[in-house]
Interface confidence: low
């Protein structure tokens, strides 16, 4: 397993609708054709997988199973959007990139993007 540099913004503020977007950029050492991107959330020293996608270079990302993530790729950049966030989801979101094919396998893990989520104030006479 070879190391690879991954860059992502330090801080992102989610929108009032609970949507946060950030770019995950990796320094590809070779010409990968298949890339896997995983978003991990670190909070209280616990790391959980938020979503993962495998894509062919130049094509769209395929997220699985009603994922809260969507994304597009452009060159060595992946534009990630996480939806449905609430205040309790505030935390460090780490971008992990794997160059799956062809060999050799490369792995890169970013330093993380701190996503802050503020729940909107409920409107009067509103159920939400």
């Amino acid at each position: 397993c070879k190391a690879m540099h991954v860059a992502q913004p330090a801080v992102v503020l989610a929108s009032s609708r609970g949507i946060a977007s950030f770019v995950c950029e990796y320094a590809s050492p070779g010409k990968a054709t298949e890339v896997r991107v995983t978003v991990l959330r670190q909070a209280d020293s616990q790391v959980t997988e938020v979503c993962a996608a495998t894509y062919m270079m130049g094509n769209e990302l395929t997220f699985l199973d009603d994922s809260i993530c969507t994304g597009t790729s452009s060159g060595n950049q992946v534009n990630l959007t996480i939806q449905g966030l609430r205040a309790m989801d505030t935390g460090l979101y780490i971008c992990k990139v794997e160059l799956m094919y062809p060999p050799p396998y490369y792995l890169g893990i970013g330093n993380g993007t701190q996503i802050y989520v503020i729940d909107p104030e409920p409107c009067p006479d509103s159920d939400f």
């Epitope: 993962a52 495998t54 062919m56 094509n59 769209e60 395929t62 699985l64 199973d65 009603d66």
Partner: antibody, heavy 120, light 106 residues
Framework: EVQLVQSGAELKKPGASVKMSCKAS????????MDWVRQAHGKGLEWIGN????????SYNQKFKGRATLTVDKSSSTAYMELRSLRSDDTAVYYC?????????????WGQGTLVTVSS | EIVLTQSPATLSLSPGERATMSCSAS?????MHWFQQKPGKAPKLLIY???ILASGVPARFSGSGSGTDYTLTISRLEPEDFATYYC?????????FGQGTKLEIK
Amino acid sequence: EVQLVQSGAELKKPGASVKMSCKASGYTFTDYNMDWVRQAHGKGLEWIGNINPNSESTSYNQKFKGRATLTVDKSSSTAYMELRSLRSDDTAVYYCTRDGNRYDAWFAYWGQGTLVTVSS
Amino acid sequence: EIVLTQSPATLSLSPGERATMSCSASSSVTYMHWFQQKPGKAPKLLIYSTSILASGVPARFSGSGSGTDYTLTISRLEPEDFATYYCQQRTSYPLTFGQGTKLEIK
């Protein structure tokens, strides 16, 4: 009515290749990924891979990488799977099945299957 | 790869009885999905996203679970329920299926 109609049975020799088809109708072909799953006689289900007909991006089970190729012909709403370097343990029924999305269940529609027999 | 282990491999029951089968994942999955298959036929989607009944599936079928442990229950067996049942995960590639539970008439 959603329908997936697969090509007929194939008898192949070890080392040969097979290419089967799956013709979709009753929905917009490019709106849903197409997956391929196989089942050897009396055995379980094994996912081979899938293809996005719109972008033609693919994801493969590592077990089949380099041997299986998934393609589509958007003009005829047909998905294809080619499997190369056939071995006797590739003898199985091969199914195409449609992905879903947030609003439609995945794998709710299946083709009738294509039986591939590999024998010398 | 997430490995799904179904138990029991075979379940022998009589019509009218309650059937319960399990699917255990080697690591946590978002949802579990269940298929029914009869000999010579393509699999049929039964339950998706752990507990949602697919179109046309009778209410005697139900699904539950979270994390690594999931269950399919048939409250009162009908003759047409005797078949093989597979669980499936779509949380990560490669998509995987359990080895199946064969529900047979006692």
